[in-house]
């Protein structure tokens, strides 16, 4: 579809005569008839197969034609066609005299013709005007012409329909040849596919408009290149979606179980050495002079009554010192300078000579001890507290301070951690030295069987086309990560195949 345009520029009829030579009265009121037809080697009368157009009266005798004539005429003249431009044509231009206002052919006498020109040739579609001048004995006509495509038609012969558009069926303008030229940010045969944000991951990201990057399930980040770890993952990371790979020192399904309590909490005091002994479990090895589960208690070395024979004990920075009573010496006042003659045995103890009187030994009554029966019996010396309990003298009696997990007068009873039924979902409880352990039924895990173990939704290999399957543990479902070229929740559909038309 296009338009043959004819621009009349100047008509010269100096003598004001008709083709017959007869003059016009009072002058030649001139209008034009144009006939456009298919190419003929010799232009002959017949149907104007490409179209016809007439002008109003444009002037008298000799005149120039303005670009857009008044009186309803148009210059250039338009001869539209609704077919492929063949590249060749024949053109007939007739100048007529109009004695009255009726310009219809049947209303004019045959001898009203002023002049007739006929040309033919090749003409390519284009914006440039071809200038021509035709001269007869009495007249001269100067004109130009061209063929241009109608709006939305393109190509060498105006046969390609193309309408620029900017909606979801295409974002493009039309090139001179009728091919599509995508608007910035769009691609594809019909420019309907957006160009995603630069760097947007090919498989894990997509977009619905240019410079966007929307993430497929299991991925996050500006470029959709960061996996989303399992929901609830505390101290872990992932390399593929829904994973929870624990950081060092953490364990469990959600990496929320502390396997390195020593580093994370530093429970041991006073420079003690900490050893991890299980989940949230540790042992402190105390430096000399300290005691307690966390070595939080300062130990007085005089508490063990190291001084013998009534010596008095003094705590010192680096240990202790015994102040001995008269007649005794040594680190613990263990050596005597006395004999039985000095009555060294207290509290009714009886003295026995030894080494020909050079030494002696006291035989103490019940409840007294010491080399001179000077001490009441320390009920803790026999280490009566079992399971690492700490013995404390309390006047005439003694008391055991038990370690966690033990009870009874002598810490001889193991506290059953299982007594309060800590294992959930029917788990079986086992007492251990350092706590308890739950044996979980199928489908549950965790320290207390509190975690519902996800069924492996990937076990049935639901993903097609070599896609990678991930189990979404929070919903017991699977997510397929598609290889390039496939889409669908199971990656079952190829992308970008040529459309299959129904005809």
């Amino acid at each position: 579809s296009g338009v043959f345009q004819l621009q009349l520029q100047e008509f010269i009829n100096e003598r004001g005569v008709l083709a017959s030579g007869r003059p016009c009265e009072p002058g030649c009121r001139t209008f034009f008839r144009v006939c456009l037809k298919h190419f003929q080697a010799v232009v002959s009368p017949g149907p104007c197969t490409f179209g016809t157009v007439s002008t109003p009266v444009l002037g008298t005798n000799s005149f120039a034609v303005r670009d857009d004539s008044s009186g309803g005429g148009r210059n250039p003249l338009q001869l539209p066609f609704n077919f492929t431009w063949p590249g060749t044509f024949s053109l007939i231009i007739e100048a007529w005299h109009a004695p009255g206002d009726d310009l219809r052919p049947e209303a004019l006498p045959p001898d009203a013709l002023i002049s007739k020109i006929a040309i033919q040739g090749s003409l390519a579609v284009g914006q440039n005007w071809l200038l021509d001048e035709q001269t007869s004995t009495l007249t001269r006509l100067r004109y130009s012409y061209r063929v241009i495509c109608s709006d939305n038609y393109y190509g060498d012969n105006c046969s390609r329909l193309c309408k620029k558009r900017n909606d979801h069926f295409g974002h493009y303008v039309c090139q001179p040849d009728g091919n599509l030229s995508c608007l910035p940010g769009w691609t594809g045969e019909y420019c309907q596919q957006p160009i995603c944000l630069s760097g947007c991951h090919e498989q894990n990201g997509y977009c619905s408009k240019p410079a966007e990057c929307l993430c497929r399930p299991g991925w996050q980040g500006r470029l959709c290149n960061e996996c989303i770890p399992h929901n609830g993952c505390r101290h872990g990371t992932c390399s593929t979606p829904w994973q929870c790979t624990c950081d060092e020192g953490w364990g469990g399904l959600f990496c929320d179980q502390d396997l390195n309590y020593c580093t994370h909490h530093s429970p041991c005091k006073n420079g003690a050495t900490c050893s991890n002994s299980g989940q949230r479990s540790y042992t402190c090895t105390c430096r000399p002079g300290y005691t307690g589960v966390d070595c939080e208690l300062e130990l007085s070395e005089c508490d063990s009554n190291p001084c013998r024979n009534g010596g008095s004990c003094k705590d010192q920075e680096d240990g202790y010192h015994c102040l001995c009573p008269p007649g005794y010496y040594g680190l613990h006042c263990e050596h005597s300078t006395l004999s039985c003659a000095d009555s060294p045995c207290f509290n009714g103890g009886s003295c026995r000579e030894r080494n020909q009187g050079a030494n002696y030994a006291c035989e103490c009554p019940p409840n007294f001890t010491g080399s001179n029966c000077e001490k009441k019996v320390d009920r803790c010396t026999s280490n009566p507290c079992a399971n690492g309990g700490q013995c404390l003298n309390r006047g005439p009696s003694r008391m055991c301070r038990c370690r966690p997990g033990f009870t009874g007068t002598y810490c001889e009873l193991h506290v059953s951690d299982c007594a309060r039924n800590p294992c959930a979902h029917g788990g079986t409880c086992h007492d251990l030295e350092n706590g308890l352990m739950c044996t979980c039924p199928a489908g549950f895990s965790g320290r207390r069987c509190e975690v519902r173990t996800s069924i492996d939704a990937c076990a049935s290999s639901p993903c097609f086309n070599r896609a990678t399957c991930y189990t979404d543990l929070s919903t017991d479902t699977f997510v397929c990560n598609c290889p390039y070229g496939f889409v669908g929740s199971r990656c079952e559909f190829p992308v970008g195949l040529p459309p299959s038309f129904p005809w």
Epitope: N152, R165, N166, D167, S500
Partner: antibody, heavy 121, light 106 residues
Framework: EVQLQESGPGLVKPSETLSLTCTVS??????????WGWIRQPPGKGLEWIGD???????YYNPSLKSRVTISVDTSKNQFSLKLSSVTAADTAVYYC?????????????WGQGTLVTVSS | SYELTQPPSVSVSPGQTASITCSGQ??????ASWYQQKPGQSPVLVIY???KRPSGIPERFSGSNSGDTATLTISGTQPMDEADYYC?????????FGYGTKVTVL
């Protein structure tokens, strides 16, 4: 041969939500050459375009219905769905699903047979 | 909102030419499609991109579109062509249908 089949309840109460599903067979809903649309026709009246969806999930709605319409796609089932909330008697119509072809300038070359939805208490 | 206007009805004798117009602002700058719908049936695409015919559509159906008017022409109309005809175009991202024209073959 591509075929489209609408399914869903034929009777919906006023103020409730109308829900329809279109199942596509004989072709993939994930083709980049097509959008998948919903059109309705009240009894004795003309056609009204409701909206459409691309396989990626991009949606386009008629501005006059936008506040009430949701269209979604399930590529694994080769289906797309329509939800129209807060319905009134004026929403009584035959609802069609159709394939809109990008190579045809957006012309709908395949249609479902249509399903009549009546809004009445 | 964008509107497409069609005459409510067109009557034609068998064998004659029926022309249905569809008017909208600058419609010639958009692609027009035409659908035929017979009673109790789904619409059928008969013309797309102004003047192209899908396979299986008879040659007697033709279309044109320029200025503000698209036209569907049925040459040598047959009784089986009696139906409702709808024009359709896209305004930005919204599909718009004409009000429909009932073609009666006398």
């Amino acid at each position: 041969e591509v075929q489209l089949q609408e399914s869903g309840p034929g009777l919906v109460k006023p103020s409730e939500t109308l829900s329809l599903t279109c199942t596509v067979s004989g072709g993939s809903i994930s083709s980049s050459s097509y959008y998948w649309g919903w059109i309705r026709q009240p009894p004795g009246k003309g056609l009204e375009w409701i909206g459409d969806i691309y396989y990626t999930g991009s949606t386009y709605y008629n501005p006059s219905l936008k506040s009430r319409v949701t269209i979604s796609v399930d590529t694994s089932k080769n289906q797309f769905s329509l939800k129209l909330s807060s319905v009134t008697a004026a929403d009584t119509a035959v609802y069609y699903c159709a394939r809109e072809a990008v190579p045809l300038g957006g012309g709908s070359d395949y249609w479902g047979q249509g399903t009549l939805v009546t809004v009445s208490s | 909102s964008y509107e497409l206007t069609q005459p409510p009805s067109v009557s034609v004798s068998p064998g004659q030419t029926a022309s249905i117009t569809c008017s909208g602002q600058r419609l010639g700058d958009k692609y027009a499609s035409w659908y035929q719908q017979k009673p109790g049936q789904s619409p059928v695409l008969v013309i797309y991109e102004d003047s192209k015919r899908p396979s299986g559509i008879p040659e007697r159906f033709s279309g044109s579109n320029s200025g503000d008017t698209a036209t569907l022409t049925i040459s040598g109309t047959q009784p089986m062509d009696e139906a409702d005809y709808y024009c359709q175009a896209w305004d930005r991202d919204t599909g718009v249908f004409g009000y429909g024209t009932k073609v009666t073959v006398l």
